[in-house]
């Protein structure tokens, strides 16, 4: 039994780090493998993660992380019974994938303006709270070509757009994701999408 693709890990910088790897053949990850992880800190204990299957030869492990800080560094040991298959390390702050924003709401009652709001997925005392910026994806259910991305580079989790920038009388969907430049994170997953019917008063044309 050998590791074909070494574990790579990302952290939500709050509670979970996810490590994925591939074996050289079909593997029952949960019965055959264990991923041990330990904070590099005096007297820190080792924790065991039981991996789940992620495709035939793929495995995934969700590591519960202690109260994460930027200096934290973990040793990782992948075992098959008594055989050490791989040894590595992981610094959560250098491999961050933020949590997805939540509670995306489209407010359509603001005089021909669409107001999209969502919630920051971190509590105020988490380092990422004040460092997230967002991308909002809006698309038409009727027209696949009507697909747009708005970059929200300010901290407030909201976006205002004129309803007239979208077509009237059709349904749209929106979703939002986050990233933090300060930690050079990857993008979060997209939030669940929300749907609304876009309608606005066409400006009166004078002849």
């Amino acid at each position: 039994m050998k590791v074909l693709q070494e574990p790579t890990c990302v952290s939500d910088y709050m509670s979970i780090s996810t490590c994925e790897w591939k074996m050289n053949g079909p593997t029952n990850c949960s019965t055959e493998l264990r991923l041990l992880y330990q904070l590099v800190f005096l007297l820190s204990e080792a924790h065991t993660c039981i991996p789940e299957n992620n495709g035939g030869a793929g495995c995934v492990c969700h590591l519960l992380m202690d109260d994460v800080v930027s200096a934290d560094n973990y040793t990782l040991d992948l075992w098959a019974g008594q055989q050490l298959l791989w040894k590595g390390s992981f610094k959560p702050s250098e491999h961050v994938k933020p949590r997805a924003p939540g509670n995306l709401t489209v407010h359509t009652n603001v005089s021909d303006t669409l107001l999209l709001t969502w919630s920051n997925p971190y509590p105020p005392d988490n380092y990422l709270y004040n460092h997230l910026t967002y991308a909002v994806n809006i698309w038409s259910e009727n027209d696949p070509a009507d697909f747009r991305i708005y970059n929200v580079t300010y901290l407030e989790p909201s976006l205002r757009i004129a309803a007239s920038t979208l077509k009237s009388g059709i349904s749209y969907r929106a979703r939002v994701r986050a990233w933090a430049q300060c930690y050079n994170t990857t993008w979060s997953e997209w939030s669940p999408s929300t749907k609304w019917h876009n309608s606005y008063r066409e400006p009166f044309e004078q002849h």
Epitope: F41, L42, E45, L64, D67, V69, D125
Partner: antibody
Framework: EVQLVESGGGLVKPGGSLRLSCAAS????????MNWVRQAPGKGLEWVAR??????????YYADSVKDRFTLSRDDSKNTLYLQMNSLKTEDTAVYYC???????????WGQGTTVTVSS | DIQMTQSPSSLSASVGDRVTITCSAS??????LNWYQQKPGKAPKLLIY???SLHSGVPSRFSGSGSGTDFTLTISSLQPEDFATYYC?????????FGGGTKLEIK
């Protein structure tokens, strides 16, 4: 072996005070966040409070039902967690569990609990 | 606050049965859901974290699934020691909240 041992429970009159303690052993207490969770007689579980580690400035969080009445603290040199409970109400009657937090709310070890009874 | 609703509130089953308990969140919590087991007079024990990850030392007959708002705990073949009360808990947002519990009894 991880061990959490609560103490300090007892019978107290409404408006009174109690201080619960939780002695921790078998793990690196000073790097872990800790919680208190309670369970009223015959009822479900209710999260009460959380305290983070020193590296996160001992930040505390409280359920609305206990905010401004309960105070959470820790002494890392003694591996001990404390819950100071003031202005106690009858609805605070419960078994109080000390828990280790292994990731912003995933509580992997629990003490055996200490019973607090608030009654006149 | 996020409300967690478990069903059923009680359940009778026999040793060897396959049992499913469901938990519903009042809003999307991604996969930030834990399951605990509690026996009478004892403290709860963590069974499953992050929806489907088995906590160390927990038998593989326990499994979890779901995402978003709907989650499931499954015991593939009930053992005598599994008769207990089970709680789900979200750790997406403070305050962390628990379901009302499902009491699993011997038929």
């Amino acid at each position: 072996e991880v061990q959490l041992v609560e103490s300090g429970g007892g019978l107290v009159k409404p408006g009174g005070s109690l201080r619960l303690s939780c002695a921790a052993s078998g793990f690196t207490f000073n790097t872990n966040a800790m919680n208190w969770v309670r369970q009223a007689p015959g009822k479900g579980l209710e999260w009460v409070a959380r305290i983070r580690s020193k590296s996160n400035n001992y930040a505390t969080y409280y359920a609305d039902s206990v905010k401004d009445r309960f105070t959470l603290s820790r002494d890392d040199s003694k591996n001990t967690l404390y819950l100071q409970m003031n202005s106690l109400k009858t609805e605070d009657t419960a078994v109080y569990y000390c828990t280790r937090d292994r990731g912003w709310g995933a509580m992997d070890y629990w003490g055996q609990g200490t019973t607090v009874t608030v009654s006149s | 606050d996020i409300q967690m609703t478990q069903s059923p509130s009680s359940l009778s089953a026999s040793v060897g049965d396959r049992v499913t308990i469901t938990c519903s969140a009042s809003q999307d919590i991604n996969n930030y859901l834990n399951w605990y087991q509690q026996k009478p007079g004892k403290a709860p024990k963590l069974l499953i974290y992050y929806t489907s990850s088995l906590h160390s030392g927990v038998p593989s007959r326990f499994s979890g699934s779901g995402s978003g708002t709907d989650f499931t705990l499954t015991i593939s073949s009930l053992q005598p020691e599994d008769f207990a009360t089970y709680y789900c808990q979200q750790f997406s947002n403070l305050p962390w909240t628990f379901g009302g519990g499902t009491k699993l009894e011997i038929k």
